[in-house]
């Protein structure tokens, strides 16, 4: 049975009230499913299936978020789940659009201080550790919609109200317009559009491409910062090695980022974070005597 958080309201599955016409169905193979004389067919995708307990997790996270953030108490979590479900249930998982997520976006509308936004690429854990300490700054996953979906996978099947727990489309091998990718593209675009003044981005200095044009940051967020609102993008390049004293702000991919940003009439600055552990410690205790030196 469902856990106690659902005692008062059972989750119901309904078929979506409308279906898209599908032109591209991806390259997933069809495999038989079920028993009986008439085989039922399920699309077999290359990516992992929907996270187990997905409906329960989304609803529970919504409830937790509204407890933790009293300013979001007006949110009806059952309605949020219904809107989330409605975005992908009964729809072909290679033909999801941003429009499908609009009801969810509307319910999850949230105002965060536009000058306190921290973007990140390939270094999520440190970014989250930072906003846990620096409480006035926000990553996408510190917002309701980002928090709901963080680390989850989901997809449905065309014309059935079932969630597919076996497999979901992989962005590269199957299709890019899958439920998870479209969700993150949609919320990332909105998050970047909301930013103003100085926007910070944390980048992983241990990667071969410190700035990757194909990442969500490189392909979505960079292009949706609004030059009329955003004055500067400040990159924090996080070093991995203890003895790494190179100036990674001179890396060719950082220069490429600077070029893209400058062409959009946004100023660019870059800082090396040589010691991420010390960096976090100094955010926690800025008065510490060792925090005046370079980190």
């Amino acid at each position: 049975g469902l856990n106690d958080i659902f005692e008062a309201q059972k989750i119901e599955w309904h078929e979506g009230s409308h279906h898209h016409h599908h032109h591209h169905h991806g390259s997933g193979s069809l495999v038989p499913r079920g028993s009986g004389s008439v085989p039922r067919w399920r699309q077999q995708w290359s990516g992992p299936g929907t996270t187990k307990r997905f409906p329960e997790t989304v609803l529970a996270r919504c409830v937790k978020y509204t407890e933790i953030h009293p300013e979001m108490r007006h949110v009806d979590c059952q309605s949020v789940w219904d809107a989330f479900k409605g975005a992908f249930i009964s729809k072909h998982p290679c033909n999801i659009t941003e429009e499908d997520y609009q009801p969810l976006m509307k319910l999850g509308t949230q105002t965060v201080p536009c000058n306190k936004i921290l973007l990140w690429s390939r270094i999520k854990d440190l970014a989250h550790q930072f906003t846990q300490v620096q409480r006035d700054m926000f990553t996408l996953e510190d917002t309701l919609l980002g928090y709901l979906a963080d680390d989850l996978t989901w997809c449905g099947e065309f014309n059935t109200s079932k969630i597919n727990y076996q497999s979901c489309p992989d962005w590269r091998k199957d299709c890019s317009n899958n439920p998870v990718s479209v969700f993150w593209k949609t919320v990332s675009r909105r998050f970047a559009e909301a930013a103003c003044d100085v926007v910070h981005v944390m980048l992983n200095g241990s990667r071969s491409k410190i700035f990757d044009k194909n990442s969500t940051f490189g392909s979505v967020e960079v292009h949706n910062l609004q030059p009329e609102k955003v004055q500067t993008l400040e990159a924090w390049v996080i070093h991995g090695g203890r003895e790494d004293s190179r100036d990674l702000c001179q890396d060719p991919t950082i220069k490429e980022l600077e070029s893209i940003i400058s062409k959009r009439n946004i100023q660019f600055s870059c800082k090396n974070i040589y010691r991420p552990d010390k960096f976090l410690q100094c955010v926690k205790n800025p008065e510490d005597s060792s925090c005046t030196s370079e980190i």
């Epitope: 856990n3 106690d4 958080i5 659902f6 005692e7 008062a8 309201q9 307990r53 329960e56 997790t57 609803l59 529970a60 996270r61 409830v63 937790k64 407890e67 933790i68 009293p70 108490r73 979590c77 989250h128 846990q132």
Partner: antibody
Framework: EVQLQQSGPEVGRPGSSVKISCKAS????????MNWVKQSPGQGLEWIGW????????DVAEKFKKKATLTADSSSSTAYIYLSGLTSEDTATYFC?????????????WGQGSLVTVSS | DIVMTQSPTSISISVGERVTMNCKAS??????VDWYQQKTGQSPKLLIY???NRYTGVPDRFTGSGSGTDFTFTISNMQAEDLAVYYC?????????FGGGTKLELK
Amino acid sequence: EVQLQQSGPEVGRPGSSVKISCKASGYTFTDSVMNWVKQSPGQGLEWIGWIDPEYGRTDVAEKFKKKATLTADSSSSTAYIYLSGLTSEDTATYFCARTKYNSGYGFPYWGQGSLVTVSS
Amino acid sequence: DIVMTQSPTSISISVGERVTMNCKASQNVDSDVDWYQQKTGQSPKLLIYKASNRYTGVPDRFTGSGSGTDFTFTISNMQAEDLAVYYCMQSNTHPRTFGGGTKLELK
């Protein structure tokens, strides 16, 4: 049935530390925030803070920031409160508590309390 | 922090009587006030949530009302088992804060 089972009484010397546990059962531990509440002898209730066991995120009331550290272990469905630099002011019963979906944001579920006595 | 001022601090009461206690918030907390009963040596027990909603299994002699900054908790027909300390708590903003408590004693 939701249950919060707390560890037994603790005696600590001034300046030392204690760690109290709260083992949850009857629900998926990561689905709810765990709160901690202090009650000094013969006194009222004070909210210490919360932890989200799924991410380890915490929020501790300003008064307890230098005193209490909240942690959680999802594998054992257990929340902990670590109290450091004990003084006589920390002598109290500490409760873990959580909310319930569709019952506002009050605490219908409470542990039985863990008494901490600070004595030299 | 929001201060919850509870009054009176104690009430002497006879079985069958009606008891009313109050809680005043230092700023608007909408209807985000809960009421708890705590008997000696026990954990608090949630009676009323969101100012006026009786929690599951709570007898209907317990009622709550109010919104904004002024809240009232009433026991319409005092029973011997109701002897306890009653606390209000605001759950509108962090940190959550409790009133100082109202102790019910037998006359």
